[in-house]
């Protein structure tokens, strides 16, 4: 039963943290203006992996593509591909899992090929969620170099845009959104990964055997001595329903009134 | 067509308090943020401040903070400001107008002329 | 706040005339994130409310004649009028709509001789 609810539980958590890492790579709040010196401002820009936004006082936003692979900072290039891998493991994971779940029967499959593909999905989670991790990382150290950097002509690394000082960027919400997400993948794949070790047919059972002493009809049955993992209950032959848990993947955004892309 | 029509002009004691009122009209009230300029003398502009009425977010110039207070009733459509304890600068004409693409006022109210005096 | 220098306060022309007058920003009004300058100008004649002529610096409001220019960026704008008409004489104002408070010049009165 704790094998289930470890598997049911990683494969929960991964699935929220997929999509959280998906959300964080659609977002557009990768970096948002600093407003340290000007709390209220007519004009606010933010920059995303895929294009940069400005939101006026008047309550228009302009989204801008950037609508140049070349142009783009090795950097940024290198961001959105961690993203991406992070995102195509993940779904691949989730889609492994799905049949690994020891909840859901499909035919004859044996525990063993169950307890390997919870394996799997689990290392395809954790490589997902450090992808994501790095990927926000990776941004996020971009930020802070060039949030120090006081030269007139500071480079931004975003979409190769030459800017004045006084336009500074910090973190936007979604590297806590990928940071939170990345790390939400990387437990569920650590669950999966136990709960696979509490899968593995590892049972020895002894079939009962009658020793006829003389003069006694005594029968020893020395009964199914277990080889015992460490990790919860055996719950071999038991149909365990989980009560049908389920997970919405609701990315809520907050769209301005008028998003001109 | 889009239309500011604002509350009439006002003789008002010193130390008094107002409100003009600017009923907008021929679009969504809500998609578009509100502003309040004064005019002094028929030259100087003074921006006062801004409320957004879809959720009645405002900002404000330093200058008019206190003196000013930036109000909407998104039912009637109407943009409202406050002006508490007026004096004699205080004397002028006030536009309400609307806030479109780079922050400009593309419509603005015919003013309201204020006059404080005792 | 930033301050908004207008010059000439006056300009005396000629129907027909080429006129272009002056603004100066303290600061810049160029946003880098998408490259516009948030500079407005209005055109405002006696008993009237302004009127918009030009926001970002450049972009032509709908229903303004083509005889209005605006260039500029950073901190140095121009509006140019063409060729001047009966129906130009007004007071010109530019406007910063970077950073708040938004601020006015003072003005250009524009005068037929």
């Known amino acids: 039963m704790a094998v289930t609810a470890c598997q049911g539980l990683g494969f929960v958590v991964s699935l929220i943290g997929i999509a959280g890492i998906i959300a964080a790579t659609c977002m557009d709040q990768w970096s948002t203006q600093d407003l340290y010196n000007n709390p209220v401002t007519a004009v606010f820009n933010y920059q995303g992996l895929w294009r940069s936004c400005v939101r006026e006082s008047s309550g228009f936003t302009e989204c801008r593509g950037y609508f140049t692979l070349l142009g783009l900072p090795a950097m940024l290039q290198a961001v959105r591909a961690l993203m991406i891998v992070g995102i195509v493991l993940g779904a691949i994971g989730l889609l492994v899992s799905i049949f690994a779940l020891k909840c859901i029967r499909i035919g004859s499959m044996e525990d063993s090929a169950k307890a390997n593909m919870t394996l799997t999905s689990g290392i395809m989670f954790i490589v997902s969620g450090l992808c994501a991790i790095a990927g926000v990382s990776v941004f996020a150290n971009m930020l802070v170099t060039n949030f120090w950097m006081s030269t007139a002509n500071m480079y931004t690394g975003m979409g190769g845009m030459v800017q004045t000082v006084q336009t500074r960027y910090t973190f936007g919400a979604a590297l806590f959104v990928g940071w939170v997400a990345g790390g939400l993948t990387l437990i569920g794949g650590v669950m999966m990964c136990i709960a696979c070790r509490g899968l593995a047919p590892e049972e020895t059972n002894y079939k009962a055997v009658s020793y006829h002493a003389s003069g006694h009809s005594v029968a020893y049955k020395p009964g199914g001595f277990k080889a015992s993992t460490g990790f919860g209950s055996n719950t071999k032959n038991k149909k365990i329903y989980d009560g049908g848990a389920r997970t919405e993947d609701e990315v809520q955004s907050y769209p301005s009134k008028h998003d001109y892309v | 067509e889009v239309q500011l029509q604002q509350s009439g002009p006002e003789l008002v004691k010193p130390g008094a308090s107002m409100k003009i009122s600017c009923k907008a009209s021929g679009y969504s009230f809500t998609g578009y943020t509100m502003n309040w300029v004064k005019q002094s003398h028929g030259k100087n502009l003074e921006w006062i401040g801004l409320?957004?009425?879809?959720?009645?977010?405002?900002s404000y110039n330093q200058k008019f903070k206190g003196k000013a207070t930036l109000t909407v009733d998104k039912s009637s459509s109407t943009a409202y400001m406050e002006l508490l304890s007026l004096t004699s600068e205080d004397s002028a004409v006030y536009y309400c107008a609307r806030m479109n693409y780079g922050n400009a006022m593309d419509y603005w109210g015919q003013g309201t002329s204020v006059t404080v005096s005792s | 706040d930033i301050v908004m220098t207008q010059s000439p306060s006056s300009l005396t022309v000629t129907a027909g005339e080429k006129v272009t007058m002056s603004c100066k920003s303290s600061?810049?009004?160029?946003?880098?994130?998408?490259?516009?300058?948030?500079l407005t100008w209005y055109q405002q004649k006696p008993g009237q409310p302004p009127k918009l002529l030009i926001y970002w610096a450049s972009t032509r409001e709908s229903g303004v004649p083509d005889r209005f220019t605006g260039s500029g960026s950073g901190t140095d704008f121009t509006l140019t009028i063409s060729s001047v008409q009966a129906e130009d004489l007004a007071v010109y104002y530019c406007?910063?709509?970077?950073?708040?408070?938004?601020?006015f010049g003072a003005g250009t009165k524009l005068e037929l001789k």
């Open positions: 600061q810049s009004l160029l946003n880098s994130g998408n490259q516009k300058n948030y």
């Open positions: 409320i957004n009425p879809y959720n009645g977010g405002t």
């Open positions: 406007q910063n709509d970077y950073s708040y408070p938004l601020t």
